[in-house]
Interface confidence: low
């Protein structure tokens, strides 16, 4: 094909007339915007075919692509098509008009696209802007095609200045259609409902815009159809949601609900199922066991935890000695009940820096209109032992006594020991345990009292030593479940004044 003038780009004057000629070895034709404009076709004596396109009274609207192609070009190579681009600078035409579909650009993947805003004059400076922005975007411009690049889902306009007049193009809208491998999730407002309550399920697809939902459910199998509702959640990433709503559930509505989603562009599909249980009435059930006796350590924090299942959500109350507990403003008690799954709850009572007065009988009660459960336990406050007094005396009988007094909860054990070699014991030699009945040289008498108000035990133990012939280190050790305490006294013979 031979085109005269050859181009590939021509700038012609407005209102002028111009002739384009195309010739080839087979019939040829000029095309403009996929149409064949009026033209003169001829065949020369040498067998050459030609077509002459005369452009008269040119205006800016004549700006654009012109193609010369073989008349029967189907199946011919692309080099058998010649392209010519003509500019007709026309100050009365701003941007060339677009078909409506050119203003909406749809994509299914991230790829370069062209915003086809074109002007009649190749000398004009054209800039691209977001519709609501003044800043020019750094995108390359081709006067024959427009702006090409990777664009976000926004609205864009082109701007140019013709003389002293700023001209805006129509707005172009870029839409990225989401088509990806399907990711379906199914949620139920509740997976457990009482008969007469509603069942509401949501099937959500993320990342696709063109999908079809199909639900299967127990009612459908018996021919009772329910019409789902589909809506868009205007969000990123795209969410489409189908809602299946069954009012006034019956026991027969228990079973598996399946949402099947197909996507028509790439023919992907996925399905998810969820089980719904319709119960005759609500329930509350304790899970696991809590011992009837619980312990807390004085001045430490203690959390008491009860796990249970319930539907519908219950009210939870805690009592101490039959009086209702609430979060204390001083922060000594904290109550919390949290939902760890749809029907499973953990209720916690936290005692902060436990006091003796917090010992007592505790009850947790969980209830709703259909059912109730309660759990009770006794809380014992454990108090680390402390030795309050260790004293030595010389009664007239000639024996020597050492008295040890201490307190704690639970009841402390008392251990007496002695060191006869003050230089080496207790570092090198172990102390000797005292108070065993087999030893005649010492006797032990121990009394235990429980103090109700302080809720702790007092131990008073008296050690009688028959004959002390040299200085002796006597140690009293009190022990219970939460600690131990020791004090020591030096016992000297009657006849020996003890000096340090």
């Amino acid at each position: 094909l031979v085109v005269t003038p050859p181009g590939p780009e021509l700038v012609l004057n407005v209102s002028s007339t111009f002739v384009l000629t195309c010739s080839g070895s087979a019939p040829v034709v000029w095309e403009r915007m996929s149409q064949e404009p009026p033209q003169e076709m001829a065949k020369a004596q040498d067998g050459t075919f030609s077509s002459v396109l005369t452009l008269t009274n040119l205006t800016g609207l004549d700006t654009g692509e012109y193609f010369c192609t073989h008349n029967d070009s189907r199946g011919l190579e692309t080099d058998e098509r010649k392209r010519l681009y003509i500019f007709v600078p026309d100050p009365t035409v701003g941007f060339l008009p677009n078909d409506a579909e050119e203003l909406f650009i749809f994509l299914t993947e991230i790829t370069e696209i062209t915003i086809p805003c074109r002007v009649t004059d190749p000398q004009l400076v054209v800039t691209l802007h977001e519709k609501k922005g003044d800043v020019a975007l750094p995108v390359p411009y081709d006067h024959q095609r427009g702006f090409s690049g990777i664009f976000e889902d926004r609205s864009y306009i082109c701007k140019t200045t013709i003389g002293d007049r700023e001209v805006d193009s129509d707005a172009y809208y870029v839409y990225r259609l989401q088509v990806s491998s399907i990711n379906v999730s199914v949620n139920a407002v509740q997976t457990v409902v009482r008969q007469g309550e509603n069942i509401t399920l949501m099937c959500i697809v993320i990342g696709n815009e063109v999908v079809n939902f199909e639900w299967t459910y127990p009612r459908k199998e018996s021919g009772r159809l329910v019409e789902p509702v589909t809506d868009f959640l205007l969000d990123m990433p795209y969410h489409i949601r189908s809602i299946l709503h069954i009012p006034s559930a019956e026991l027969e509505d228990s079973g598996t609900y399946t949402c099947n989603v197909t996507e028509s562009v790439n023919d992907h599909q996925d399905e998810k199922a969820i089980n719904i249980t319709v119960v005759e009435s609500g329930y509350v059930r304790l899970l696991g066991e809590v011992g009837t006796l619980q312990f807390a350590e004085l001045h430490r924090s203690r959390t008491l935890q009860v796990v249970f299942e319930a539907y519908p959500p219950p009210t939870v109350l805690w009592f101490k000695d039959n009086r209702t507990l609430g979060d204390s403003s001083a922060g000594e008690i904290a109550l919390s009940t949290r939902n760890v799954s749809e029907t499973r709850y953990v209720s916690e009572l936290t005692l902060v820096r436990v006091k003796v007065a917090e010992a007592g009988h505790y009850t947790m009660r969980a209830f709703h209109e259909d059912a109730e459960v309660q759990l009770s336990f006794q809380l014992q406050i454990n108090v680390p032992v402390r030795v309050l007094e260790l004293s030595e005396s010389h009664p007239d009988s000639g024996e020597q006594t050492v008295r040890c007094r201490g307190r704690g909860m639970p009841q402390p054990n008392i251990i007496w020991s002695a060191c006869r070699d003050l230089k080496r014991c207790p570092r090198e030699l172990p102390p000797t345990l005292l108070g065993n009945s087999s030893e005649e040289e010492s006797q032990l008498e121990t009394n235990v009292t429980y103090w109700e108000e302080e809720q702790e035990f007092e131990v008073v133990s008296t050690l009688r030593l028959q004959h002390v012939d040299r200085p002796l280190s006597v140690r009293c050790t009190l022990r219970n479940a939460v600690g131990q305490d020791t004090q020591e006294v030096i016992v000297v013979p009657h006849s020996l004044p003890f000096k340090v």
Partner: nanobody
Framework: EVQLVESGGGLVQPGGSLRLSCVAS????????MSWVRQAPGKGLEWLSG?????????TYAESVEGRFTISRDDAKNTLMLQMNSLKSEDTAVYYC???????????????RGQGTQVTVSS
């Protein structure tokens, strides 16, 4: 039209605290369970905490924030709150409040949600 507007984000040092608020309109707030979710840079949405509607007012938390974050609501003011204590650098994210039908375990529907508030934890 459902509208959720978060506020209270900002820059805080590790170990510090922030309190986020979310004002809701366009739906019956007192009848809706609500959640907080977040999106860290380059990551997907992470559900943090949910609170039920009605008298039970049960709360539930993701392991990553349990014991540090506390969700609460004021139905009279249509406001959802998130008290965040002992903040760590990995808590840096955009935080959104979301209207949730229900969180079944940790499987939540995160939409609709607000525009988000940026929380940056950095020394």
């Amino acid at each position: 039209e459902v509208q959720l507007v978060e506020s209270g984000g900002g820059l805080v040092q590790p170990g510090g605290s922030l309190r986020l608020s979310c004002v809701a309109s366009g739906f019956s707030f007192s009848e809706s369970a609500m959640s907080w979710v977040r999106q860290a840079p380059g990551k997907g949405l992470e559900w943090l905490s949910g609170i039920s509607s009605g008298g039970g007012r049960s709360t539930t938390y993701a392991e990553s924030v349990e014991g540090r974050f506390t969700i609460s609501r004021d139905d009279a003011k249509n406001t959802l709150m998130l008290q965040m204590n002992s903040l760590k650098s990995e808590d840096t994210a955009v935080y959104y409040c979301a209207k949730t039908g229900y969180c079944s375990g940790y499987n939540c529907n995160f939409a609709p949600r607000g525009q988000g508030t940026q929380v940056t934890v950095s020394s």
